[in-house]
C-alpha cells in the first residue's frame, strides 16, 4: 500500500535542523500539510500545493519553511531549534484517489556536554569533583590507578532542559594520588570523552 | 499514441458478474491512476473507484457495497473491473479513464454492459 | 456522501453566445472541482480541473471558477461543437460525485 518514509533527526539546541517526508507514490499528492502533535490535537503550521504555494501558520512564521518545495517529497527547516521544537510532527499528503496519507518525522534536541572536573584536599583526604551538563542527561564514570575508591553521584534536572551529573571521587590517602592521573569519562549519545587531571600537592 | 481500449459488450443474468478489461498503450501504465465509472441510460455519472498500477492500491464507492473489485495486470498493461451479483439496475455502460493526478485526460471507448433475464 | 447540484438542468442558446452553468457543492470541497462534456454514446471529456485550470488542447473559450462550494462553467462563445451535455466532478472526498448534469442545447 503507499505510505509515506521518513527519518527521525536528533540536532543540537540553537542550530538548524530539517524534517523530509517522501510519498512513496506513483503520483504526487494535491497538497502537502505539515503539523506538530500535540496532547489534544495536532497543529497545523505550513502547507504547500500548486494553486497557493507556501503558507505557514503565525505562529511558525519565523521558526519553519518548507526547503524542498515538492508535492512527493517534502522538507522543513527550523532556522534554529528550541526546546520547544522538540516533539513529533505529521506530514500529510493529500493525493488525488486515496485522500491523507501521513508519515510521522521526530525531532529530538541536544546539548552538548559542558564538563568541570576539579580537586580539593581537605585533611586527610582527598575528593576529585566532575560534573557534566547535557540534554540528555550524560553519564559519568572514573578511571583510576587503583581499585577501591569511593565515588557519590548526584543528578541535578535543570529548568532549560538539560541535566547536570556530578560525581565525586573520595580518596582517603591523597599522598598515593599526588603526580598520577585521574580520568573522569563522560557519556553522552553513545560517545564517551575523557578529561584527564593530574593531581598536585597544592 | 495513447489509447485505452475496452472489451466488447455484454448481456448477463441477474446475480451473475461482469469483467470489464481496460488495455493502455502508448504510455507507462504504472504511472497513471486507472478509474472507472459508469452511466446507466440516462443517468448522470457515477464514479466506481480507481486504482494505482503503481502499487496494486485500489478505492472503491462504498455504494456498491463490496460487489466492484478494481485489479491490474501490469505485464499485459491491462486493468480490470469486475461487478458481482448484477441486477437490471446496473445496465449501464462502463468506462475508463486514466489520470495523473486529478488531470483526467484519456478515456475508453465505454462498454455496455446490459443485465436482464 | 457530498451531493453536487448543477443548474440549470437544460439550456438553449446560439452560437456565439456566452454560456455560464453553475454547480454547487454541498460542504467546502476547496479548489477541487472539474468539468466535463459529453456527447451521446462518447466517453466523457476533460474540460478544467482544480476549479479553474484548463485541460490542454480544451479551448480557450472554456473557463472555470469558483472554490469553496460555488463552481461555475463559462464559454465564453458557443460553438455548434459545444453542444452536448456538461458534468461537474468533486474529488475532496470519496466517494468522488458528479453532478446531475446540464444539457446544453441549440436554441
Known amino acids: 500500500q503507499v505510505q509515506v518514509v521518513t527519518q527521525d533527526e536528533r540536532e543540537q539546541l540553537y542550530t538548524p535542523a530539517s524534517l523530509k517526508c517522501s510519498l512513496q507514490n506513483a503520483q504526487e499528492a494535491l497538497i502537502v500539510t505539515w503539523q506538530k502533535k500535540k496532547a489534544v490535537s495536532p497543529e497545523n503550521m505550513v502547507t504547500f500545493s500548486e494553486n497557493h504555494g507556501v503558507v505557514i501558520q503565525p505562529a511558525y512564521k519565523d521558526k519553519i519553511n518548507i526547503t524542498q518545495l515538492g508535492l512527493q517529497n517534502s522538507t522543513i527547516t527550523f532556522w534554529n531549534i528550541t526546546l520547544e521544537d522538540e516533539g513529533c510532527y505529521m506530514c500529510l499528503f493529500n493525493t488525488f484517489g486515496f485522500g491523507k496519507i501521513s508519515g510521522t518525522a521526530c525531532l529530538t534536541v541536544y546539548v552538548q556536554p559542558i564538563v568541570s572536573l576539579h580537586y580539593k584536599f581537605s585533611e586527610d583526604h582527598l575528593n576529585i569533583t566532575c560534573s557534566a551538563t547535557a540534554r540528555p542527561a550524560p553519564m559519568v564514570f572514573w578511571k583510576v590507578p587503583r581499585s577501591g575508591i569511593e565515588n557519590s553521584t548526584v543528578t541535578l534536572s535543570h529548568p532549560n532542559g538539560t541535566t547536570s551529573v556530578t560525581s565525586i571521587l573520595h580518596i582517603k590517602d591523597p599522598k598515593n594520588q599526588v603526580g598520577k592521573e585521574v580520568i573522569c569519562q563522560v557519556l553522552h549519545l553513545g560517545t564517551v570523552t575523557d578529561f584527564k587531571q593530574t593531581v598536585n600537592k597544592g | 499514441q495513447v489509447q485505452l481500449v475496452q472489451s466488447g459488450a455484454e448481456v448477463k443474468k441477474p446475480g451473475a458478474s461482469v469483467k470489464v478489461s481496460c488495455k493502455a498503450s502508448g504510455y507507462s501504465f504504472t504511472d497513471y491512476i486507472i478509474l472507472w465509472v459508469r452511466q446507466a441510460p440516462g443517468q448522470r455519472l457515477e464514479w466506481m473507484g480507481h486504482?494505482?498500477?503503481?502499487?496494486?492500491?485500489?478505492n472503491y464507492n462504498l455504494k456498491f457495497k463490496g460487489r466492484v473489485t478494481i485489479t491490474r495486470d501490469t505485464s499485459a498493461s491491462t486493468a480490470y473491473m469486475e461487478l458481482s451479483s448484477l441486477r437490471s439496475e446496473d445496465t449501464a455502460v462502463y468506462y475508463c479513464?486514466?489520470?495523473?493526478?486529478?488531470?483526467?485526460?484519456?478515456w475508453g471507448q465505454g462498454t455496455l454492459v446490459t443485465v436482464s433475464s | 456522501d457530498i451531493q453536487m447540484t448543477q443548474s440549470p438542468s437544460s439550456l438553449s442558446a446560439s452560437v456565439g453566445d456566452r454560456v455560464t452553468i453553475t454547480c454547487k457543492a454541498s460542504?467546502?470541497?476547496?479548489?477541487?472541482l472539474s468539468w466535463f462534456q459529453q456527447k451521446p454514446g462518447k466517453a466523457p471529456k476533460s474540460l478544467i480541473y482544480?476549479?479553474?485550470r484548463l485541460v490542454d488542447g480544451v479551448p480557450s473559450r472554456f473557463s472555470g471558477s469558483g472554490s469553496g462550494q460555488d463552481f461555475t462553467l463559462t464559454i465564453s462563445s458557443l460553438q455548434p461543437e459545444d453542444f452536448a451535455t456538461y458534468y461537474c466532478?468533486?474529488?475532496?472526498?470519496?466517494?468522488?460525485?458528479f453532478g446531475q448534469g446540464t444539457k446544453l442545447e441549440i436554441k
Open positions: 466532478l468533486q474529488y475532496d472526498e470519496f466517494p468522488y460525485t
Open positions: 479513464g486514466r489520470s495523473k493526478r486529478d488531470y483526467f485526460d484519456y
Open positions: 486504482i494505482d498500477p503503481y502499487y496494486g492500491s485500489s
Open positions: 460542504q467546502d470541497i476547496n479548489s477541487y
Open positions: 482544480r476549479a479553474n
